[in-house]
């Protein structure tokens, strides 16, 4: 889609005559008809396939045409088209004399034509005007023309539609060739993707507008490269989201157990020395003259044995003085560098000295972790057991106790209880969610049809003449034990009276 623009500049008709040579009376009141059509080697009459336009009367005989001429006309003349510009054209410009005010073709005599020019050729889309001058015997017309694309159309033939936008669907302007040019801060095929703050972490961060860096759950900071500790964490940090790695002096799953009670709570009174002795526990070493769990009670001088670590106490007028053995110092010989001697490892952890005894490291037994072996390892937290299996911590490992009908390390396999033919004596096995069930044949009972049930063949009293009835368990039939004087399978015949 585009516009062929024709700028009329000057028309010269010095003698004021028509094409027939006849003069106009009083002068040639001139207007123009323009016909734009497809390229023809020889321009012939016919439909103006690319469009046509007429001007009002622009002047008399010879005149210059001003831009955007008054009198309702427009200069340049606009011939819009809504197809791909083919690059070639034919143009017919006719100058007509208007004796009256009606400029319609049917209202004019055929001999009102002043001049007619026809050109054809190639024309590329562009902003530059092509200047042309056509001269006949009596007239001269100077004009220029060009083809430009309509708003939002671009490219060599005005076929590329591009409408600049700055909304949810894109943030761009259009280049001369119709390609998109993203506004600053946007990228992607349609400039819908914001360019995040420089340095914003590729995985942990994202943005909804340029120069922003929003963090995905579990991450924080300007560039989303710092993790967030677990919700319940109290005195810990993280190296991956939702962790809780305890600060020095804290233990437990959420680092809420005080391993350094002395520093955090200062429980020892009267200048006593505090020693941590496990989670939330401590020992106060009292200064001379004090006693009690927190050294809150006063004693006299050396009675309280104030000197620690083998130090000997000497009474003095203003108190006492401790003589410390080698390796210890301080008012009560209480100071030594924290080392394995202080038994810092809990839960049976073994202590290894480091830096020539200046520090230590704990080697934890299975099931315990942490810098002081203070945390119990729970290997069941990830719920590894499938199908309702129960997870059990077993020393350094874990095991799953499976529900009936399931097996495998993680209870992941379903076992058919009937697979091993558990029903005895031809019983039929049924695999149920709660276990198996056997349907037993006659004469058998029990969970697995393992119990033989005697069929009472004597129930129908088959024996006559007060004979005793017994059930034969091998055949489930009755046997009659006849009294004296009777015979027969049912003792139905008296002796001496055989069946007739």
């Amino acid at each position: 889609s585009g516009v062929f623009q024709l700028q009329l500049q000057e028309f010269v008709n010095e003698r004021g005559v028509l094409a027939s040579g006849r003069p106009c009376e009083p002068g040639c009141r001139t207007f123009f008809r323009v016909c734009l059509k497809h390229f023809q080697a020889v321009v012939s009459p016919g439909p103006c396939t690319f469009g046509s336009v007429s001007t009002p009367v622009l002047g008399t005989n010879s005149f210059a045409v001003r831009d955007d001429s008054s009198g309702g006309g427009r200069n340049p003349l606009q011939l819009p088209f809504n197809f791909t510009w083919p690059g070639t054209f034919s143009l017919i410009i006719e100058a007509w004399h208007a004796p009256g005010d009606d400029l319609r073709p049917e209202a004019l005599p055929p001999d009102a034509l002043i001049s007619k020019i026809a050109i054809q050729g190639s024309l590329a889309v562009g902003q530059n005007w092509l200047l042309d001058e056509q001269t006949s015997t009596l007239t001269r017309l100077r004009y220029s023309y060009r083809v430009i694309c309509s708003d939002n159309y671009y490219g060599d033939n005005c076929s590329r539609l591009c409408k600049k936008r700055n909304d949810h669907f894109g943030h761009y302007v259009c280049q001369p060739d119709g390609n998109l040019s993203c506004l600053p801060g946007w990228t992607g095929e349609y400039c819908q993707q914001p360019i995040c703050l420089s340095g914003c972490h590729e995985q942990n961060g994202y943005c909804s507008k340029p120069a922003e860096c929003l963090c995905r759950p579990g991450w924080q900071g300007r560039l989303c490269n710092e993790c967030i500790p677990h919700n319940g964490c109290r005195h810990g940090t993280c190296s991956t989201p939702w962790q809780c790695t305890c600060d020095e002096g804290w233990g437990g799953l959420f680092c809420d157990q005080d391993l350094n009670y002395c520093t955090h709570h200062s429980p020892c009174k009267n200048g006593a020395t505090c020693s941590n002795s496990g989670q939330r526990s401590y020992t106060c070493t009292c200064r001379p003259g004090y006693t009690g769990v927190d050294c809150e009670l006063e004693l006299s001088e050396c009675d309280s044995n104030p000197c620690r670590n083998g130090g000997s106490c000497k009474d003095q007028e203003d108190g006492y003085h401790c003589l410390c053995p080698p390796g210890y110092y301080g008012l009560h010989c209480e100071h030594s560098t924290l080392s394995c001697a202080d038994s810092p490892c809990f839960n049976g952890g073994s202590c290894r000295e480091r830096n020539q005894g200046a520090s230590y490291a704990c080697e934890c037994p299975p099931n315990f972790t942490g810098s002081n072996c203070e945390k119990k390892v729970d290997r069941c937290t990830s719920n590894p057991c499938a199908n309702g299996g129960q997870c059990l911590n077993r020393g350094p490992s874990r095991m799953c106790r499976c529900r009936p009908g399931f097996t495998g390390t993680y209870c992941e396999r379903h076992v058919s209880d009937c697979a091993r033919n558990p029903c005895a004596h031809g019983g039929t096995c049924h695999d149920l969610e709660s276990g198996l069930m056997c349907t037993c044949p006659a004469g058998f009972s029990g969970r697995r049809c393992e119990v033989r049930t005697s069929i009472d063949a004597c129930a129908s009293s088959p024996c006559f003449n007060r004979a005793t009835c017994y059930t034969d368990l091998s055949t489930d039939t009755f046997v009659c034990n006849c009294p004296y004087g009777f015979v027969g399978s049912r003792c139905e015949f008296p002796v001496g009276l055989p069946p007739s």
Partner: antibody, heavy 118, light 107 residues
Framework: EVQLVESGGGLVQPGGSLRLSCAAS????????MAWVRQAPGKGLEWVAT????????TYRDSVKGRFTISRDNAKSSLYLQMNSLRAEDTAVYYC???????????WGQGTLVTVSS | DIQMTQSPSSLSASVGDRVTITCRAS??????LAWYQQKPGKAPKLLIY???NLADGVPSRFSGSGSGTDFTLTISSLQPEDFATYYC?????????FGQGTKLEIK
């Protein structure tokens, strides 16, 4: 025990300023991101601002950007909210909370009431 | 912003009842959802995070479920101290947003 105690609320005229404070204890303050969440009278909860623990980077809801400033002092275990150009619609109980805009708000203070009215 | 819609907005129940509150997100928030309990004049308290994880010290009668856009808070057997307003909150997308609340009252 984790404790968050807000202060600084009160009555202020539209266009006025107020500075809220929050004193934290019971956890290592410097390790955790913090937030302000508000609740207008009789209404629901609305996140206001967050500050990271690592670099003190602030984030705000659109309606308070340019007017409110969140800050922290790790040495004092304190969180602050400087509120300027206050509007009637900022009237609410302001809660100090431990959390970030992309995590749950695990612990909350008792709240401090800010009333913006002429 | 993601809209969080709770239902019902209010609910009457008796001690011992099983109660369910639902929360719907306007788009997928995966499992990044928390539930809070608030009593009149008090601060909210975190009950459940990551859809189904119980916060420290929360009784086991509270449970959460769901994923994507539909979530549920269940109280298996109501206790007198459970009568309060409950809020859901998503923290998957910026900014974090809360539901409008569900007021649980004694019948």
């Amino acid at each position: 025990e984790v404790q968050l105690v807000e202060s600084g609320g009160g009555l202020v005229q539209p266009g006025g300023s107020l500075r809220l404070s929050c004193a934290a204890s019971g956890f290592t303050f410097r390790n955790f991101p913090m937030a302000w969440v508000r609740q207008a009278p009789g209404k629901g909860l609305e996140w206001v601002a967050t500050i990271s623990s690592s670099d003190g980077w602030p984030t705000y809801r659109d309606s308070v950007k340019g007017r409110f400033t969140i800050s922290r002092d790790n040495a004092k275990s304190s969180l602050y909210l400087q509120m300027n150009s206050l509007r009637a619609e900022d009237t609410a109980v302001y809660y100090c909370s431990r959390g970030y805009y992309n995590s749950p708000f695990a612990y909350w203070g008792q709240g401090t009431l800010v009333t913006v009215s002429s | 912003d993601i809209q969080m819609t709770q239902s019902p907005s209010s609910l009457s129940a008796s001690v011992g009842d099983r109660v369910t509150i639902t929360c719907r997100a306007s788009e997928d928030i995966y499992s990044n959802l928390a539930w809070y309990q608030q009593k009149p004049g008090k601060a909210p308290k975190l009950l459940i995070y990551d859809t189904n994880n119980l916060a420290d010290g929360v009784p086991s009668r509270f449970s959460g479920s769901g994923s994507g856009t539909d979530f549920t808070l269940t109280i298996s057997s109501l206790q007198p101290e459970d009568f309060a307003t409950y809020y859901c909150q998503q923290y998957n997308n910026y900014p974090p947003t809360f539901g409008q609340g569900t007021k649980l009252e004694i019948k």
